[in-house]
């Protein structure tokens, strides 16, 4: 079941899953000046049985102006390295670290993508919250949000995450702040 | 199930200082951030500011910068709003509310300033 | 500071008529806003928030809709328990402020 809405922003805030449960589509959009192959999928999609859960289609972008030519899907290493986003919590660390069965993980990038990724997330799934460079967590609640589906309708929980700019906390004598997670992801994903 | 419990009302001389409590209980207190509200008779909701349950951390609007100090005591669940050189334009009803999106409230305690 | 402008100030409606509650923000405030209704002498209770989720418990007749400065809260057929006050409010950044309110009398 595919979640109604985006998962909820917060400001000053950037969001990302870990790991994408089957029935996950991902759009297959461009940059600015290149277009889908004519024969390409419009999506991708995460599926799998019980053993493997992996990304169905590949998404291929040609450039508008070149009527003929297709461009391989092959990242290069620099893009691959300006994709790779910091990790944002301890629970994403360890996700990262092992297969969590029905899930397929990020998909790499392919040549001549769209800046954001556009996400249709499914009922269960988890995005995990981060503030953005230059912002603090004033409040770190619970940092995530869990698409849930409740009385026939679909609705992701709040995140009680708290970012803010302001420089000088009004921090009380013998109180320190906790550690503050790495600052920022360098790009948002949204869902639609 | 939730619940937020506030001090009972107070009546105070200008000048001087109150402090109001919020007492949380049926969920993880450090989870939610609390927030301090007030409304004047008659009036509109003022936001106050916004503490960490978590972190003590807090934000205050610029209005009350310098006469407000919002602190929490975790081993009690409970919140705190201190207002200091009380005058008779702080007579209100003062509410705490949780989280990001304000989801449950206290019931308000009033503050009557007065010589 | 975000300003909150709600119109209108009072309005008076019968039972099973459908009620509409404007909230207009003073910059884009995406859709980091919430309806709260309060009863004369209780504390406010949150109707929807994000601009269009309804809150736990709250009949469907309350609706929310709107994104960027221009916000509304329907309530599709008014019952006698709906008098109160409602005010719009956001939380896209602090200070979070809210509307001056919105005064629904059953006639």
């Known amino acids: 079941e595919l979640c109604d809405d985006d998962p909820p922003k917060i400001t000053h805030a950037t969001f990302k899953a870990v790991a994408y449960k089957e029935g996950t589509m991902l759009n297959c959009e461009c940059k600015r000046g290149f277009r889908r192959i004519k024969s390409g999928s419009p999506y991708m999609l995460c599926t799998g049985n019980s053993s493997h859960s992996s990304w169905d289609n590949q998404c291929q972008c040609t450039s508008s102006a070149a009527r003929n030519t297709t461009k391989q899907v092959t990242p290069q290493p620099e893009e691959q390295k300006e994709r790779k986003t910091t990790e944002m919590q301890s629970q994403m660390q360890l996700a990262d670290q092992v297969s969590l069965p029905g899930h397929c993980r990020e998909p790499p990038p392919w040549e001549n993508e769209a800046t954001e990724r556009i996400y249709h997330f499914v009922v269960g799934q988890t995005v995990y919250y981060q503030c953005v460079q230059g912002y603090r967590a004033l409040h770190r609640g619970p940092a995530e949000s869990v698409c849930k589906m409740t009385h026939g309708k679909t609705r992701w929980t709040q995140p009680q995450l708290i970012c803010t700019g302001e420089t000088e906390p009004s921090q009380f004598p013998g109180e320190e702040e906790p550690q503050a997670s790495p600052d920022g992801l360098p790009e948002s994903e949204t869902s639609r | 199930q939730v619940q937020l419990v506030q001090s009972g009302a107070e009546v105070k001389k200008p000048g001087a200082s109150v402090k109001v409590s919020c007492k949380a209980s049926?969920?993880?207190?450090?989870?939610?951030?609390m927030h301090w509200v007030r409304q004047a008779p008659g009036q509109g909701l003022e936001w106050m500011g916004v503490?960490?349950?978590?972190?003590?951390?807090?934000i205050y609007a610029q209005k009350f910068q310098g006469r407000v100090t919002m602190t929490r005591d975790t081993s009690t669940s409970t919140v705190y709003m201190e207002l200091s050189s009380l005058r008779s334009e702080d007579t209100a009803v003062y509410y705490c509310?949780?989280?990001?999106?304000?989801?449950?409230w206290g019931q308000g305690t009033t503050v009557t300033v007065s010589s | 500071d975000i300003q909150m402008t709600q119109s209108p100030s009072s309005l008076s409606a019968s039972v099973g008529d459908r009620v509409t509650i404007t909230c207009r923000a003073s910059q884009d405030i995406s859709n980091y806003l919430e309806w709260y209704q309060q009863k004369p002498g209780k504390a406010p209770k949150l109707l929807v928030y994000n601009a269009k989720t309804l809150a736990e418990g709250v009949p469907s007749r309350f609706s929310g809709s709107g994104s960027g400065t221009d916000f509304t809260l329907t309530i599709s057929s008014l019952q006698p328990e709906d008098f109160g006050t409602y005010y719009c409010q956001h939380h896209y950044d602090t200070p979070y402020t809210f509307g001056q309110g919105t005064k629904l009398e059953i006639k």
């Open positions: 503490i960490s349950t978590y972190s003590g951390d807090a």
């Open positions: 509310a949780r989280g990001v999106t304000f989801d449950y």
């Open positions: 049926g969920y993880t207190f450090t989870d939610y951030a």
